[in-house]
């Protein structure tokens, strides 16, 4: 048997050698057909001559007396050798224009040639066949076809590819589908339906590799075909829009002096569209940059979203711009299957600044210095200035405003906070400044409806003073009701102002009203012992936030702050 194979090989080698002396149309190595098959699985490979190179099919060629000969070159070898069609169980066979492996082995990798010839005609083509190994999760070096599914689109299907012709229609194979490593059974949104896999709805999480394993019987043997494809979930055509040019736009003006570098970005958003060519280009005075003499460079970058929507940026750059360049029209254009748009960039020449004399510069310097001094003085003494102005020129806010109280105090009902409110705040604000405070627990009548009374008191007050502390932010407290009511009143009718006094630091809070209030309003911080002193900023800040009120109980010491005696026993 071995001897016979050697004889056949030598005879075949002789044919190839004689063929070299005769003319044969050699189409070379068809690298476009990089055929990859899994080890230990059947493979059927059609001779590419009839598919891509010749104008007739195998039947025509056969009836014209042409013979199809197969041979191969092993991987990393140069020697062409015949294919052994006498292997046990007919492992490699030829049927018409198809070369069959049942199944493949790893060392079947190589370049295969099919040659069609008779005594007067010869044509041949080679193609690479790679037998690859896969792991238990179907991972392999195989190049995978990509199938795109639309997001938010309804039922879509993928079909197990390249299984036609492996078994007759009378054979009913079993098909198992996998997502990555997982067998698809009762999946959330994916249903196996024989050769098809149906996506009831495609989610971004469905991105990945899907494998169908087709099992079929043949001549008492069982064969498996493994086919993997990549699913990519992309933007739906229902949501597709024409290109959107984000820049240039009407808000940005490119103002340059001659000699400077001009950089204009054109940023365009393209909705994902299957097989759409997205294009971005610049025109200068209506011409493409290549058609004009200016030294222009254009750099492009492309980024994609999770659903393959595309953002393209083309930066037009002129290294040293001239005044003529600054008078030109720069227009960015964009086109997709959905339409074409264009936007002009606003380019203008910067007016050079006039040359200032030394005197003018000195004058400007002196002015700046004076302004800086005034700003510093204002920053240091602004509270005193405001209080001085109010004491002498302020108009009394309280006349005929229909309010009964100056301040409604909202605080956490807690021993420490109560002491601060009833002794410190009340002592100073009522006794020293002559304000009328409304403290719910002191001024409310027993037996009343808390909610109604609270709202009534707040409506009768000019200010809502909120004493912030960690206890304040506990959900469902009376204090929170007061805060919500005050903020509501302030936002809707504007007839109450809210003052935030931070008695104790409050960490991150989930109370949205308080969050919002803290971002909008200034928080006056109580700093313990430091804040008790009359000249302290705390009382001055508080005074500024209070209503302007001409009170006979207030003395000229108001501008100085308050007497220490009123605080020392607080």
């Amino acid at each position: 048997m071995t001897l016979l194979w050697c004889v056949v090989s030598l005879y075949f080698y002789g044919i190839l050698q004689s063929d070299a002396s005769e003319r044969c149309d050699d189409w070379g190595l068809d690298t476009m057909r990089q055929i990859q098959v899994f080890e230990d699985e059947p493979a059927r490979i059609k001779c590419p001559l009839f598919e891509h190179f010749l104008k007739f099919n195998y039947s025509t060629a056969h009836s014209a007396g042409l013979t199809l000969i197969w041979y191969w070159t092993r991987q990393d070898r140069d020697l062409e050798e015949p294919i052994n069609f006498r292997l046990p169980e007919n492992r490699i066979s030829k049927e018409k224009d198809v070369l069959w492996f049942r199944p493949t082995l790893l060392n079947d990798t190589g370049n295969y040639t099919c040659m069609l010839r008779n005594t007067t005609y010869c044509s041949k083509v080679a193609f690479p066949l790679e037998v690859v190994q896969k792991d238990s999760c179907f991972n392999s070096p195989m190049k995978l076809p990509v199938h795109k599914l639309y997001i938010e689109y309804g039922i879509q299907r993928i079909t197990c590819p390249n299984v036609d012709g492996y078994f007759p229609s009378s054979v009913k194979p079993t098909i198992t589908w996998y997502m990555g490593c997982y067998k698809i059974q009762n999946f959330n949104n994916v249903i196996p339906e024989g050769m098809n896999l149906s996506f009831l709805i495609a989610l971004i999480s469905n991105n990945g590799n899907y494998t169908c394993v087709v099992t079929y019987p043949e001549n008492g043997r069982t064969f498996h075909l493994t086919r993997t494809l990549t699913v990519k979930v992309v933007g739906s055509p229902k949501n597709a829009v024409p290109p959107v040019i984000h820049s240039p736009n009407d808000h940005v003006v490119y103002e340059k002096e001659p000699g400077e570098e001009l950089l204009i970005p054109c940023t365009v958003y393209f909705s994902f569209l299957m097989d759409s060519r997205n294009e971005v280009w610049w025109t200068i005075d209506g011409k493409k940059p290549d058609d004009i003499t200016i030294d222009v460079t254009i750099n492009e970058s492309i980024s994609h979203s999770r659903t393959e929507d595309e953002t393209r940026t083309q930066i037009l750059s002129i290294k040293k711009v001239t005044s003529e360049d600054l008078k030109r029209s720069y227009v960015c254009h964009a086109r997709s299957a959905k339409g074409e748009v264009a936007k002009a960039a606003k380019v203008k020449q910067k007016v050079p600044a006039p040359r200032y004399t030394v005197e003018l510069a000195c004058g400007f310097g002196a002015t700046v210095l004076l302004v800086v001094i005034l700003i510093v003085v204002y920053h240091v003494y602004w509270l005193e200035m405001v209080l001085f102005y109010r004491a002498h020129f302020g108009t009394d806010e309280t006349i005929l405003d229909g309010k009964e109280y100056d301040i409604y105090v909202s605080y956490a009902r807690n021993a420490e906070e109560e002491e601060f409110v009833l002794l410190t705040l009340r002592g100073v604000l009522e006794n020293e400044f002559g304000y009328k405070l409304c403290i719910f627990d002191r001024d409310s009548l027993p037996g009343g409806i808390v909610t109604d009374e609270t709202l009534s008191f707040i409506q009768k007050s000019r200010r809502l003073l909120v004493v912030l502390s960690p206890n304040y932010v506990l959900q469902g407290t009376q204090a929170l009701l007061e805060l919500k009511a005050g903020l509501e009143n302030m936002a809707s009718r504007g007839n109450i102002n809210v003052i935030l006094v931070q008695y104790k630091a409050v960490k991150e809070t989930k109370v949205k009203e308080l969050k919002r209030a803290k971002t909008v309003l200034t928080v006056i911080k109580w700093k313990g012992e430091k804040s008790k002193y009359p000249q302290g900023r705390f009382w001055k800040q508080l005074q500024v936030a209070m209503p302007v009120k001409k009170s006979p109980r207030r003395s000229s010491s108001d501008e100085q702050g308050l007497s220490y005696s009123s605080l020392k026993n607080v």
Epitope: I151, Y153, C181, Y182, Q185, N188, I201, L203, I204, S205
Partner: antibody, heavy 119, light 107 residues
Framework: EVQLVESGGGLVQPGGSLRLSCAAS????????MHWVRQAPGKGLVWVSR????????TYAESVKGRFTISRDNAKNTLYLQMNSLRAEDTAVYYC????????????WGQGTLVTVSS | DIQMTQSPSTLSASVGDRVTITCRAS??????LAWYQQKPGKAPKLLIY???SLESGVPSRFSGSGSGTEFTLTISSLQPEDFATYYC?????????FGQGTKVEIK
């Protein structure tokens, strides 16, 4: 921002029927699917049923199959759960939830409606 | 059906603590897992999806990890508003199933 509001809960006798509604305010349902999830008093969450946004395919938990029917009225922006042959073990707070159209997650939930099955 | 087992069932912790809740699936679910927070009388609120992605608007102290059958929810520094019950939820295979819940309470 879409908000979901359930209604239709209440007290019903064993063997009775009830129809729950879930209305979307502030926009359409959107998403990939609408789901019903229930929670018996003091217990955990249990998925009940879903209906797909596209194609209207419905799926049910084994415990309610044949007794409950999920449906939706896109014009009214409302999801329904028709509950027949109610049993004591169906007593729960029923939530409707939206399945996101991008990722597997229930991103918006209603506040829930209580169904009590008792004689 | 896939069983989702959460541990511990109850967890006592203090404000500022690092808290970890584990969820185990009876079979592999890839990363198709979500975590929810539920407070008494309220609807569940989505925290984490796709096993590790943070839902928008959820504080960054919450994080998720894991794939296959083992998943973890971590709260890096427990805040007063985090005391609640937490549920894991597998969305890969029907019927969807939730863990039995982990109650995080004040120590």
């Amino acid at each position: 921002e879409v908000q979901l509001v359930e209604s239709g809960g209440g007290l019903v006798q064993p063997g009775g029927s009830l129809r729950l509604s879930c209305a979307a305010s502030g926009g359409t349902f959107g998403g990939s699917a609408m789901h019903w999830v229930r929670q018996a008093p003091g217990k955990g969450l249990v998925w009940v049923s879903r209906i797909l946004t596209y194609g209207g395919i419905a799926t049910y938990a084994e415990s309610v199959k044949g007794r409950f029917t999920i449906s939706r009225d896109n014009a009214k922006n409302t999801l329904y759960l028709q509950m027949n042959s109610l049993r004591a073990e169906d007593t729960a707070v029923y939530y409707c939830a939206r399945g996101s159209s991008e990722y597997p997650k229930f991103d918006i939930w209603g506040q829930g409606t209580l169904v009590t099955v008792s004689s | 059906d896939i069983q989702m087992t959460q541990s511990p069932s109850t967890l006592s912790a203090s404000v500022g603590d690092r808290v970890t809740i584990t969820c185990r699936a009876s079979q592999s679910i890839s990363s198709w897992l979500a975590w929810y927070q539920q407070k008494p009388g309220k609807a569940p609120k989505l925290l984490i999806y796709d096993a590790s992605s943070l839902e928008s608007g959820v504080p960054s102290r919450f994080s998720g990890s894991g794939s296959g059958t083992e998943f973890t929810l971590t709260i890096s520094s427990l805040q007063p508003e985090d005391f609640a019950t937490y549920y894991c939820h597998q969305l890969l295979i029907y019927p969807h199933t939730f863990g039995q819940g982990t109650k995080v309470e004040i120590k």
